[in-house]
């Protein structure tokens, strides 16, 4: 299953399959997730080790048993790959690292005014993988405001150095934020020239394209089909690059197919997994296990659940079957692709779905109608769980926020439905940033069921929580995916990085905002909060957040939206925007429904609604 916990001051011994430099443990974990054999990782921050060569070291590890002995190492961080973690699987990494220079091949230098502009340039350059930016206070004046675009053979820095007044980060192309745009076209009977960066076997050109998309240096590819004239080259997928970023030439060639990486696509990237099953095909590889199962789909599920399994073959040979069950061969290889693809066999083959974003239907659960005051504009995909609850009567307007917590579930505030309990009038927009982008053609979700907490009473602040079941499940993308819920009764975690988002008013007597706003707000203890609200009862089922001096807060139109906190690299839904005295007033924090206190209720309602569990807490 999905294991998200991190082990501090611990290092996994042995099992090494690869090593690289990464700026933090989260990026190391992402590299482990996308490495075909990595199950575990250990990361050494700069502070944890004196050996300059091992600083920022990220060590990717495999283990037949799925675990390795942990040794104590001060400052080290270890953890698990996020294979099998559904919507948490993403190659997108937005963080910017201050005081760090990520080294690589510098292929472009320009002057820019901010690190954000440098990151944008990297994202809009086809070859850029990461960048470094020298701030205005950099010690050498001639380098100030320099934006260095970089790449390396493996897509990660060749070294990372601590350097004052330098900021580094990665391209946001894996976040589907590139302005370059992509070529979706597949060119039949055409072979591209240029440099081969890798060679793998794939059953079709589309698997080849997906592998190219997620390979750090692949810009385009050529695939030789299973009817290619040279038998030894059939099903070969050649991953390619060039100096210019495009093929320098192409040759008409029967039974070849060529195309481009989709990494530069805007708004949508292919899932990093291959779900198709190939009849009459045998995938060769190292045998992991053989089991008897009923049907090829069960064989694929078995492979997906066995974390080391990369691909499988389900044999229908009479000698491999007994009664209704046949042999399911679970296999793996060094690069995650079959070592041999044979046609005309009595079997079907396919891949593990361990890297699919969608996973199953389960979700990681790991007084004034209260926009964000004192906030700033959000960017695409920054808060992919945020939804806009809109009402369509004569006109259509945004009324509340909400949080996507599952394919078919949204969590919001009960008071959003005061006087508007009819599900037909509501439209739920997900995967959006600007309200002005909504037109009559913009897809929206309709409500199947509104479940208001049984103890909620209109005009009272208690139990201000409601679940919305959508009529149809939503697919997950970089711009539309769920937020993890906290563990039941989560009181021990100290959250220091919390944000509130919404399209609500920017001042008390304001108006709905066009661009989704975000504001970083510290949590306030319930005791402190109670002092500020002596006329109201602040219960243990509420959580407060705000600055003593005011100036930053949620406001009208943000209700029902998320208060999220990042802990150990993972975002969790800590609160639901509920109420407050005015907006952003001094010593008047915002009051939020404490989600952890309602976990039993959420699980009960999402399970009873259709008879099966929809949520699971993070391990």
């Amino acid at each position: 299953g999905c294991l998200t916990q991190l082990y501090e001051n611990a290092f996994f011994r042995g099992g090494d399959v690869a090593s690289m430099y990464t700026p933090n443990a989260q990026y190391c974990q992402m590299r482990c997730t996308f490495h075909p054999r990595c199950l575990l990782f250990s990361f050494l921050p700069a502070s944890s080790i004196n050996d300059m060569e091992k600083r920022f070291g990220c060590f990717l590890k495999d283990s037949v048993t799925g675990t390795l002995p942990k040794v104590h190492r001060t400052g080290a961080v270890s953890g698990h790959s996020l294979k099998q973690c559904g919507h948490q699987i993403s190659a997108c990494h937005r963080d910017i690292y201050k005081g760090v220079d990520m080294r690589g091949v510098n292929f472009n230098v320009s002057k820019v005014s901010s690190v954000e502009e440098c990151q944008k340039r990297c994202t809009s350059n086809i070859r850029c993988q990461f960048f470094s930016y020298a701030t205005q206070t950099f010690h050498k004046a001639e380098y100030r405001n320099n934006c260095l675009l970089k790449y390396s053979p493996g897509g990660t820095p060749t070294a990372i150095k601590v350097l004052s007044n330098v900021e580094s980060g990665f391209s946001l192309k894996p976040c589907a934020l590139s302005e370059i745009g992509c070529h979706m076209n597949i060119f039949q009977h055409l072979a591209f020239s240029d440099v081969d960066v890798a060679r793998v076997l794939t059953p079709d050109a589309f698997v080849c394209r997906t592998i190219c998309t997620y390979h750090p240096n692949c810009l385009f590819f050529t695939f030789y089909t299973n009817v290619w004239k040279i038998e030894s080259q059939r099903n070969v997928c050649l991953l390619k690059t060039s100096e210019s970023g495009t093929p320098s030439s192409s040759t008409p060639q029967e039974n070849t197919i060529s195309g481009y990486s989709l990494l530069t696509c805007k708004r949508t990237l292919p899932e990093p997994c291959h779900s198709k099953i190939y009849p009459g095909v045998d995938f060769g590889g190292e045998e992991l296990n053989v089991t008897f199962v009923k049907g090829v789909n069960v064989c694929q599920e078995t492979c997906t659940k066995m974390i080391r399994c990369q691909f499988f073959t389900y044999s229908l040979l009479p000698e491999d079957c007994k009664e209704e069950k046949c042999k399911c061969f679970l296999r793996l290889s060094m690069d995650g692709s079959p070592t041999r693809i044979a046609y005309g066999t009595q079997g079907s083959s396919g891949y593990s779905l361990r890297l699919c974003n969608t996973g199953d239907n389960s979700v990681c659960t790991t007084k004034t109608s209260t926009r964000i005051v004192g906030g700033t504009n959000s960017s695409w995909g920054e808060w992919p769980w945020q939804v806009s609850l809109q009402v369509k009567l004569t006109a259509q307007r945004h009324l509340c926020g909400g949080s996507l917590i599952g394919h078919q579930w949204v969590l919001t505030a009960a008071h959003c439905f005061d006087g508007l309990p009819l599900q037909d009038v509501w439209r739920i927009y997900s995967g959006i940033l600007n309200l002005s982008d909504i037109t009559k053609d913009t897809p929206f979700s309709q409500i199947k069921e509104i479940i208001i907490h049984q103890n909620y009473k209109v005009s009272e602040g208690n139990h201000d929580i409601a679940l919305i079941k959508l009529q149809a499940p939503l697919n997950y993308t970089e711009f539309q995916k769920p937020i993890c819920l906290p563990s039941k009764g989560d009181t021990s975690t100290i959250y220091t990085n919390c944000w509130v988002t919404g399209w609500g008013f920017s001042k008390e007597k304001g108006e709905i905002q066009n661009i989704l706003q975000k504001v970083n707000i510290p949590l306030v203890t319930n005791e402190e909060c109670q002092k500020r609200y002596q006329d109201y009862k602040i219960t243990q089922r509420m959580v407060c957040a705000g600055y003593k001096e005011g100036g930053k807060d949620a406001c009208k139109g943000d209700s029902g939206g998320p208060l999220v906190c990042k802990h150990n690299g993972m975002w969790r839904l800590v609160g639901i925007t509920s109420w407050g005295e005015g907006c952003a007033r001094r010593e008047q924090p915002g009051v939020y429904t404490k989600v952890a206190e309602y976990m039993d209720w959420i699980l009960e309602k999402t399970q009873s609604s259709d008879g099966k569990a929809q949520m699971q807490s993070p391990a």
């Epitope: 597949i186 099953i277 079907s348």
Partner: antibody
């Protein structure tokens, strides 16, 4: 020219049998999976059966399982569909189609042969 | 089996119109969605495979998009020869399944 040509259709009584043939030309027949697809009068397309390039693997729609048999003779570049215990609901135009190696789409179709089941 | 739902079942349009046909799969089929054109008394003809790739020889006014469960076929500038029935088909899983078809008629 890449071509598929069906034959063997005709009128048959319920419970009767018929054998359809599909002659392939213009491509290396032995390297492609093949399919039979049918279309009842005025209706949509329905997949009937699949066979792998060597003939080692076959599959059938539930509606014909146990009654129809797909086979191929790669030396003759010919695909067959043996239809037994025919029913009124089997009445349709039967098409053979080549399965493209690149996508599993049906990229080449025959012109179709009509099977009429009537007493 | 994966169900394919096509809409509309028929539509009336004029030469030069932009026509859009949608197809929804009952479960995710990645990009393994194909579109066919069939004229009366003729065999179907492959137009688009893998959701968006134009089959050789098919005019560029035909385009396809989508992935997962929702797909679209667009004819950008309808020509007289385009009046026909269009079928979507998934090739993601055995058995391959077709939509019920969309008949594009003259307005």
């Amino acid at each position: 020219e890449v071509q598929l040509l069906e034959s063997g259709g005709g009128l048959v009584q319920p419970g009767g049998s018929l054998r359809l043939s599909c002659a392939a030309s213009g491509f290396t027949f032995s390297m492609y999976p093949m399919m039979w697809v049918r279309q009842a009068p005025g209706k949509g397309l329905e997949w009937v059966s699949y066979i792998s390039p060597s003939g080692g693997m076959t599959d059938y729609a539930d509606s014909v399982k146990g009654r129809f048999t797909i086979s191929r003779d790669n030396s003759k570049n010919t695909l067959y569909l043996q239809m037994n215990s025919l029913r009124a609901e089997d009445m349709a135009v039967y098409y053979c189609a080549r399965v493209a190696g690149s996508s599993d789409a049906f990229d080449i179709w025959g012109q179709g042969t009509m099977v009429t089941v009537s007493s | 089996d994966i169900q394919m739902t096509q809409s509309p079942s028929s539509l009336s349009a004029s030469v030069g119109d932009r026509v859009t046909i949608t197809c929804r799969a009952s479960q995710s089929i990645s990009i393994y969605l194909n579109w066919y054109q069939q004229k009366p008394e003729k065999a179907p003809k492959l137009l688009i495979f893998a959701a968006s790739t134009l089959q050789s020889g098919v005019p560029s006014r035909f385009s396809g998009s989508g992935s997962g469960t929702d797909f679209t076929l667009t004819i950008s500038n309808l020509q007289p020869e385009d009046f026909a029935t269009y079928y979507c088909q998934q090739s993601h899983s055995i058995p391959p399944t077709f939509g019920l078809g969309t008949k594009v008629e003259v307005k």
